[in-house]
Interface confidence: low
């Protein structure tokens, strides 16, 4: 009877310089003696070494040298006894591509290499970028706590540094940039704003980073209405707070452009002495059309804004003057093109 | 008088395209944004999206990205979907529309039918 | 997306009547919900704006109320020529949704 000597391993595996694998592995050898128990020991080979000899990648025998550049790096995981001969391998370089082999020994009978399944490593350039984690969405003055990891990159070899940047951490300690956990307090002004985590492995070359773009949630800020006059000069008139009175002669062209600061984008509308107008124009882009005027189309006009975060409003009487001349009088003004619907 | 008028009915193949026009007049061309909507037979109405015709900036549903394609030609103010692919379920009245004036008045198309058979 | 349910697929009424055409908004839509009228062969019309504002020319038996997620379109004394189907939409956020319709029969 032919003993029989078998190995499930894969054929190839790809790793990213800097991570981990762990490859599954089980063997069979034959074991008949019920009168002795000798040490099992199963060694990882690089191809074309000599078992005799050479140095191995990773063994269970204490007495075997291992290469000390896998030292620590190329361990076996699970139970020999139970013919598990799985490889882990960490903080994997590029000089580690290239095919191993397995090789068991116990007492004098059992001694096998098993050439024909040999295991393909090749370790290819670090694409593998760090995973931001947040709980979204971010709010404005309400600290929130972010971490960085790298998928793929295990306990085996070096610890991995981390560094932090973007806008939002100026007035951060250079220290607490440097965890792999941040608290950060988010402003309006950094909605938009890239944050990066850069992570490093100690002693190695090698650098990945990932940067996210920051969804700031914050409350309506800088509420105006802008009034542009349809008479081709884009004359401006910009309100700021309640009660201004704004003449304006009957016959007249206006829009009314109402502008808020918020994330997400507020609800805008607009009433006319407490009624809403335009549904589907104003609720998207706060703009409002008044054309032609007439003498009783004047009054209080309010844009309402609406948001998650809190809700403003801001009023201003239209006096509609009848027509008399063909000038405008506007006290406050400034140049601007005149805006069209959107 | 405010009009928008829309190109007549089609019937094609499945796996063609089909493009749709929409000419309006009786008011400023550029100043309202396009809507478009598309109503399958006996169906309720679904929106597919709308284009700025001042700038050509389109806002799409979801669902219609990759399917329909709203452009403009301002010098002819005609707004156009354009749409690819066609299965049998993209059978249907498809209507443009725009919101007018002080109080957002809808103009709507007379719809055109669009038939996917082979 | 937000989901306008018409529960109601189709009702029916007699001339001089008054009937209740309703419509819930899947999530808070305030008052930004219009209804439309469609008669058959024809494109939608315009009714109610703002939850119950109604546009100029729109005859006064029709009436829209509601905010937040439950609207009602009601038309008191029913006419002949109100048989059509009719339409919630809500214009809140993107995508501006519908609902499925409720069909209008006069007896």
């Known amino acids: 009877e032919k003993p029989v000597y078998e190995l499930q391993v894969q054929k190839s595996v790809t790793v990213q310089e800097g991570l981990c694998v762990l490859v599954p592995c089980s063997f069979s050898y034959p074991w008949r003696s019920w009168y002795s128990s000798p040490p099992l020991y199963v060694y990882w080979f690089r191809d074309g070494e000599i078992p005799y000899y050479a140095e191995v990648v990773a063994t269970n025998n204490p007495d075997r040298r291992v290469k000390p550049e896998t030292q620590g790096r190329f361990r076996l995981l699970g139970d020999v006894q139970k013919k598990n001969c799985s490889l882990s391998i960490g903080d994997a370089r590029m000089e580690d591509t290239g095919s191993y082999f397995f090789r068991v020994e116990r007492g004098r009978d059992v001694k096998y290499s098993y050439q024909q399944n040999k295991l393909n490593l090749e370790v290819t350039a670090l694409i593998e970028k760090p995973d931001i984690h947040f709980l979204e969405p971010l709010e404005s003055g309400r600290p929130t706590r972010l971490s960085c990891s790298l998928p793929g990159s295990c306990e085996a070899g070096p610890p991995l540094t981390f560094s932090w940047t973007g806008n939002a951490l100026s007035p951060l300690d250079p220290e607490t940039t440097r965890s792999s956990e941040l608290t950060l307090t988010p402003r309006p002004e950094d909605h938009g704003t890239n944050l990066t985590c850069q992570v490093k492995r100690q002693g190695a070359q090698v650098t990945t980073e990932r940067t996210v773009q920051l969804n700031v949630s914050y409350a309506p800020q800088n509420l105006a209405i802008s009034i542009f006059f349809r008479n081709g000069t884009g004359t401006a008139l910009r309100i700021l707070s309640n009660g201004m009175s704004v003449p304006i002669q009957e016959g007249q062209s206006l829009f009314l452009a109402c502008t808020v600061d918020s994330n997400p984008p507020a609800s805008l509308s607009w009433f006319r002495e407490g009624k809403a107008l335009n549904p589907s124009q104003t609720s998207m882009s706060g703009t409002l059309e008044l054309p032609n005027i007439g003498a009783r189309e004047g009054g209080e006009f309010t844009c309402r804004v609406q948001h998650p975060l809190g809700s403003q409003h801001l009023s201003f009487i239209l006096s509609v003057q009848r027509s008399s001349s063909s000038c405008i009088c506007v006290t406050e003004k400034q140049q601007g093109s005149w805006p069209l619907l959107t | 008088e405010i009009q928008l008028q829309q190109s007549g009915p089609e019937l094609v193949k499945p796996g063609a395209s089909v493009k749709v026009s929409c000419k309006a007049s009786g008011y400023s061309f550029t100043d309202y944004n396009m809507y478009w909507v598309k109503q399958s037979h006996g169906k309720s109405l679904e929106w597919i999206g709308y284009?700025?015709?001042?700038?050509?900036?389109?806002t799409y549903n979801q669902k219609f990205k990759g399917k329909a394609t709203l452009t403009v030609d301002k010098s002819s103010s005609t707004a156009f979907m354009h749409l690819n692919s066609l299965t049998s379920e993209d059978s249907a009245v498809f209507y443009c529309?725009?919101?007018?004036?002080?109080?957002?008045?809808?103009?709507w198309g007379q719809g055109t039918l669009v038939t996917v058979s082979a | 997306d937000i989901v306008m349910i018409q529960s109601q697929k189709f009702m029916s009424t007699s001339v001089g009547d008054r009937v209740s055409v309703t419509c819930k908004a899947s999530q808070n839509v305030d008052t930004n919900v219009a209804w439309y009228q469609q008669k058959p062969g024809q494109s939608p019309k315009a009714l109610i704006y703002s939850a119950s504002y109604r546009y100029s020319g729109v005859p006064d038996r029709f009436t829209g109320s509601g905010s937040g997620t439950d609207f009602t379109l009601t038309i008191s004394n029913v006419q002949s020529e109100d048989l059509a189907e009719y339409f919630c939409?809500?214009?809140?956020?993107?995508?501006?949704?519908f609902g499925s319709g409720t069909k209008l029969e006069i007896k």
């Open positions: 284009i700025d015709p001042y700038n050509g900036g389109t």
């Open positions: 939409q809500q214009y809140n956020s993107f995508p501006l949704t």
């Open positions: 529309a725009f919101y007018y004036g002080y109080y957002g008045v809808p103009y």
